[in-house]
């Protein structure tokens, strides 16, 4: 009974599947199935996923497109990158603020939010590594300014003030009295 | 023993809707495409709709696509023709089918039939 | 959609002797080596039969009297010794793609 099985075609492989009655080409990313082929190893019938909404890859069976997530501007989040009839919208922080996850485990997909980047100039810092995944990281403080408790000192500007032995090493002063 | 059983013609007015039925038994209902075909009085054969095995996925000719929707039950092991806004062209003996599929080519033949249910549009 | 035409439209043949029916269609019903086309015979109200498939092959419980052949966009059905009871129509029918069609029939009567 029947033929021999077409090489071009074959029913289990990546290119065709069954679907429907045939095996049939799956369609694009960025389109979805509005019919499956109408005879062996035929094209599907697909369209163009609509505004937004996206499907990233080759599919045999998407009826529908996924909904294009929406930034979470509550979590101060903005849009990197917007969404396309192949790739959904890729979310994160604008510059100046960090992604802080909301799991432990943190991956791609974990919910997050966006917490703005600590000021090392502010805080009289050296900036040691700028804040893009985490938060800065903030070196040793700048020159005029030295080590007090947790923050940096600004030197004294006359031989008037106080300057402790940390003072005197950065400052280059001498506690007078 | 094999059997196609049909009911739910009858006489209905241009417009009007009718729900064919057709219940299947001697065979594993699930695991066969299913058809209807139709024959106009006096005329030839012409291929209605077909809905597969599996997923149900159903294909329509234009003079029906639309008007026309198959469904099937496999719990039931029934088939139904839903016919809508029908019209006097519409008249015809429709006959359920099982679908064969012969060998790794993806070919159908209709290798049983329903005894026919008269369907007739007038007013 | 594929135009599936008949010849003749009707036959008169005598009892022993051979019939052959002529089938057209308007494009290759050819796939993967496979001419995807059948044959049925309809009785006087009685549903149609299947009698061949895939152009060549009898299907199970058909007199051995009926055969197909052809490929491509040609074929024919063969009845070698006529029986009264071949008295019918005959369609042939494609699966190549839907929509599925049918040939238009050819009434076979006994001469």
């Known amino acids: 009974q029947g033929g021999t099985r077409s090489p071009r075609c074959d029913c289990a492989g990546d290119f065709h599947k069954k679907i429907g009655l045939f095996c049939c080409r799956g369609c694009p990313a960025g389109h979805y199935l509005k019919a499956p082929c109408t005879e062996p190893c035929g094209n599907s019938t697909c369209l163009v996923c609509p505004q937004d909404t996206f499907l990233a890859w080759e599919n045999h069976h998407n009826s529908e497109c996924a909904r294009c997530q929406a930034c979470d501007e509550q979590a101060s989040q903005v849009a990197l990158e917007n969404c396309s009839a192949v790739a959904d919208t890729r979310c994160g922080c604008k510059p100046g603020w960090f992604v802080e996850c909301q799991v432990s485990q943190c991956v791609s997909s974990s919910p997050f939010y966006c917490q703005p980047c600590l000021d090392c100039g502010a805080l009289h810092r050296h900036t040691r590594l700028l804040c893009s995944r985490r938060d800065t990281d903030c070196g040793t403080c700048l020159p005029g300014f030295y080590e007090h408790g947790d923050g940096c000192v600004s030197c004294p500007t006359s031989t008037l003030g106080s300057c402790p032995e940390r003072c005197a090493a950065v400052c280059g002063w001498r506690q007078m009295f | 023993q094999m059997q196609l059983v049909q009911s739910g013609g009858g006489l209905v007015k241009p417009g009007g809707s009718l729900r064919l039925s057709c219940a299947a038994s001697?065979?594993?209902?699930?695991?066969?495409?299913m058809s209807w075909i139709r024959q106009a009085p006096g005329k030839g054969l012409e291929w209605v709709s077909t809905?597969?095995?599996?997923?149900?996925?159903?294909y329509f000719p234009d003079s029906v696509k639309d008007r026309f929707t198959i469904s099937r039950d496999n719990a039931k092991n029934s088939l139904y023709l839903q016919m809508n806004s029908l019209r006097a062209e519409d008249t015809a003996v429709y006959y359920c089918?099982?679908?064969?599929?012969?060998?790794?080519?993806?070919?159908?033949?209709?290798?049983?039939w329903g005894r026919g249910t008269l369907v007739t549009v007038s007013s | 959609d594929i135009v599936m035409t008949q010849s003749p439209d009707s036959l008169a043949v005598s009892l022993g002797e051979r019939a052959t029916i002529n089938c057209r269609a308007s494009?290759?019903?050819?796939?993967?080596?496979?001419?995807?086309m059948q044959w049925y015979q309809q009785k006087p109200g009685q549903p149609p039969k299947l009698l061949i498939y895939?152009?060549?092959n009898v299907e199970s419980g058909v007199p051995d009297r009926f055969s197909g052949s052809g490929s491509g966009t040609d074929f024919t059905l063969t009845i070698s010794s006529l029986q009264a009871e071949d008295v019918a129509v005959y369609y042939c029918?494609?699966?190549?793609?839907?929509?599925?069609?049918f040939g238009q029939g050819t009434k076979l009567e006994i001469k």
């Open positions: 089918t099982r679908d064969r599929i012969y060998g790794s080519v993806q070919y159908y033949a209709m290798d049983y």
């Open positions: 001697g065979f594993t209902f699930s695991s066969y495409a």
């Open positions: 809905i597969s095995d599996g997923d149900s996925y159903s």
């Open positions: 494009e290759s019903v050819e796939f993967s080596g496979t001419s995807l």
């Open positions: 895939a152009a060549s």
């Open positions: 029918q494609q699966s190549r793609k839907l929509p599925y069609t």
